[in-house]
C-alpha cells in the first residue's frame, strides 16, 4: 500500500505565439480545480474509462480576477498535494490524466459554469520510494508544470511497496537473511510469507509461496542438509543420489543485471548495482523511451533512444499533446470571446455566450441584452438599443417563447394545404402534385417525376415533411 503524490507547480500560458486569454474576466471571476486520474500499466484506455489506480481532486484554488489589459499570468493554484492512495502493489508503470477545470463565480443565467480548460496525459515508469519526478505537459496554448512520486505507507517498502518492514527485535542486527530497511535503518525487512513449512532458518523467498534454500541446505522446504565431504565445489544444487553439492550456476552467473548493471552475490541471492537512469531488482526499470511506445493514437515516436534523452511524439492529424493523447480541441484556442463557453461538437464549434454578448464567437457586446435571455435556443442580438431575439427554427415571439406556426411561410407548393403537426408540418397536395411540399407534378400516365413516392404512399396523399 502507498500513496501517489502530485504537486502542481504552475498552470499558465505556454511559450511561443498564440498565448491564451485569461480564463477569468474582470466581470466574472473564477477559480481552478485540478483532477488526476491514474491507471495501471501503459494503458491505451480512453480518458473517460475508470481510474483503476485511483483519482484525486485538488482543493479549490483562490478566486482569480483578470486585470484588464494584462497578459494571462500563471494562475493562482490550490494549496497542497493531490494524493491518490493505492491499496495493492505499486505497478511501476502507469498512465495519468491531469485535468484543469474552471469554475466561474458570480450570478449568471443558467447557474454557475464549469468548463475543462486543459487535459494532459502521459505514460510513465516510476519506482515507489524514489525522488520526485518533474514533468512539463502542454495542452493547446496552456502549459502545466508538475512533480510526482509514489511512496510506500509503513510497513511497506520497496520499489513496488510489496516488502514489509518491522521494528528490530535486536538492537544490533536483523534476523538471519533479513536486510535493514533503507532508509529506515532501525527497522528490518519482514519475511515474506513463504511456502508453508519452508525452513525459517535455512529457506527464504523472494515471491510469496516459494522456498529457496541458503547454501548448505536442500529439499523442497530447505530442511535437508547437504554433505560437502566429497565434493569438488562448495556450491550448487544438490545431487539427488549423493546429497553432495555438484558444481552449478552461481546467482551472478550469466549476469542477471540488465542495462549494464553489475552483479554481486549476497548470502541470500544477488544484488545489482545499476547505471544512472536505471533501477529495479535487475536494473530493468528505466525512464520512458520510444521502446515503451509512449505515443497514443498512432503517433510517431522520435528520439528517446535512452532514458536521458527526451522523446518527441509526432501526432497524426486530429491529435495533439505531448503523447498525442488528446483529440485536437479547437476550444483550447479560446475562440469564444467575452467569457463565452466553447463547445466542440465535432462537426462544428459552438459558443454559448454570456448574457450581454452575441455572435458566432460572442464578439458582439449587447448592453441591451444584458440580463435578458432568449428561450428555446434563441440568440439575443443587438437591435438599436432594444432587446431582440433571433429565434431557433419553430419558435417566435419577443423571447422565442411562442411556438412559431410552421405553416406561416406557406411551404406547400401548387395549392397544397398545410397542417401543423407535432413533428413539423404536413402538406396535403392538390390533385396532380406530390412530394413533401407538393413540389413534384404527377405525370398523366401515373408515373411521377423524381423522386418516386415512398412505398405505400399514393400520389396526392398527404406527405409529412420532417
Amino acid at each position: 500500500a502507498g500513496v501517489f503524490e502530485l504537486q502542481i507547480h504552475s498552470f499558465g500560458p505556454g511559450p511561443g505565439p498564440g498565448a491564451p486569454r485569461s480564463p477569468c474576466s474582470a466581470r466574472l471571476p473564477c477559480r481552478l480545480f485540478f483532477r488526476v486520474c491514474l491507471k495501471p500499466g501503459l494503458s491505451e484506455e480512453a480518458a473517460e474509462s475508470p481510474c483503476a489506480l485511483g483519482a484525486a481532486l485538488s482543493a479549490r484554488g483562490p478566486v482569480y480576477t483578470e486585470q484588464p489589459g494584462a497578459p494571462a499570468p500563471d494562475l493562482p493554484l490550490p494549496d497542497g498535494l493531490l494524493q491518490v492512495p493505492f491499496r495493492d502493489a505499486w505497478p511501476g508503470t502507469f498512465s495519468f490524466i491531469i485535468e484543469t477545470w474552471r469554475e466561474e463565480l458570480g450570478d449568471q443565467i443558467g447557474g454557475p459554469a464549469w468548463s475543462l480548460l486543459a487535459r494532459v496525459a502521459g505514460r510513465r515508469r516510476l519506482a515507489a520510494g524514489g525522488p520526485w519526478a518533474r514533468d512539463i505537459q502542454r495542452a493547446g496554448a496552456w502549459e502545466l508544470r508538475f512533480s510526482y512520486r509514489a511512496r510506500c505507507e509503513p510497513p511497506a517498502v520497496g520499489t513496488a511497496c510489496t516488502r514489509l518492514c518491522r521494528p528490530r527485535s535486536a538492537p544490533s542486527r536483523c534476523g538471519p537473511g533479513l536486510r535493514p530497511c533503507a532508509p529506515l535503518e532501525d527497522e528490518c525487512e519482514a519475511p515474506l510469507v513463504c511456502r508453508a513449512g519452508c525452513s525459517p532458518e535455512h529457506g527464504f523467498c523472494e515471491q510469496p509461496g516459494e522456498c529457496r534454500c541458503l547454501e548448505g541446505w536442500t529439499g523442497p522446504l530447505c530442511t535437508v542438509p547437504v554433505s560437502t565431504s566429497s565434493c569438488l565445489s562448495p556450491r550448487g544444487p544438490s545431487s539427488a543420489t549423493t546429497g553432495c553439492l555438484v558444481p552449478g550456476p552461481g546467482p551472478c552467473d550469466g549476469n542477471p543485471c540488465a542495462n549494464g548493471g553489475s552483479c554481486s552475490e549476497t548470502p541470500r541471492s544477488f544484488e545489482c548495482t545499476c547505471p544512472r537512469g536505471f533501477y529495479g531488482l535487475r536494473c530493468e526499470v528505466s525512464g520512458v523511451t520510444c521502446a515503451d511506445g509512449p505515443c497514443f493514437n498512432g503517433g510517431l515516436c522520435v528520439g528517446g533512444a535512452d532514458p536521458d534523452s527526451a522523446y518527441i511524439c509526432h501526432c497524426p492529424p486530429g491529435f495533439q499533446g505531448s503523447n498525442c493523447e488528446k483529440r485536437v480541441d479547437r476550444c483550447s484556442l479560446q475562440p469564444c470571446r467575452n467569457g463565452g463557453l466553447c463547445l466542440d461538437l465535432g462537426h462544428a464549434l459552438r459558443c454559448r455566450c454570456r448574457a450581454g454578448f452575441a455572435g458566432p464567437r460572442c464578439e458582439h457586446d449587447l448592453d441591451d441584452c444584458a440580463g435578458r435571455a432568449c428561450a428555446n435556443g434563441g440568440t439575443c442580438v443587438e437591435g438599436g438599443g432594444a432587446h431582440r431575439c433571433s429565434c431557433a427554427l419553430g419558435f417566435g415571439g419577443r423571447d422565442c417563447r411562442e411556438r412559431a406556426d410552421p405553416c406561416a411561410a406557406r411551404p406547400c407548393a401548387h395549392g397544397g394545404r398545410c397542417y401543423a403537426h407535432f413533428s413539423g408540418l404536413v402538406c396535403a397536395c392538390a390533385p396532380g402534385y406530390m412530394g413533401a411540399r407538393c413540389e413534384f407534378p404527377v405525370h398523366p400516365d401515373g408515373a411521377s417525376a423524381l423522386p418516386a413516392a415512398p412505398p405505400g404512399l399514393r400520389p396526392g396523399d398527404p406527405q409529412r415533411y420532417l
Epitope: F33, R35, E48, S49, P50, A55, L57, W101, E103, Q108, I109, G110, G111, P112, A113, W114, S115, L116, C331, L341, C342, L343, R352, G377
Partner: nanobody, 125 residues
Amino acid sequence: QVRLVESGGGSVQAGGSLRLSCAASGSTYSTNFMGWFRQAPGKEREGVATLVTWAERTAYADSVKGRFTISQDRAKNTVYLQMNGLKPEDTAMYYCAAAASTAVRLLDPGDFAYWGQGTQVTVSS
C-alpha cells in the same frame, strides 16, 4: 450511453417532504455533472439542483435554496433530491439529467445530454 431512472415522486401536502432517487447505468464514469430539473404544465423546463459528480460541488435554483438538498451515492451510481418544506408551486414533473460534456452551466437544461423519463411531484395546499 447513460440510462437514468427516476423514482420517489408522489402527492404530498404543503410543508411535507419527498425524496427523489435517480439510478444511473451505462457509461456512468463519463458523467461529470448530474442534476434535477422540473417542468410544470405550460412552463419551460428549469434547473432545480445539480452536482459536479467528482467534486462534491452543488448548485441550486434560488427558489429551492435551503429547502432542497442534492446528494449522491457513488457506489450505487445514484443521485438523490431531498425536498423539504414543499410548496404548491413545486408541483411539476421532475427529471434527472446527466452531462458528460466539458462545458456546462449547472442549471441550464440545454447543456445536459442524458435524461430520465421523469417522476411526478404534486403538492396540494
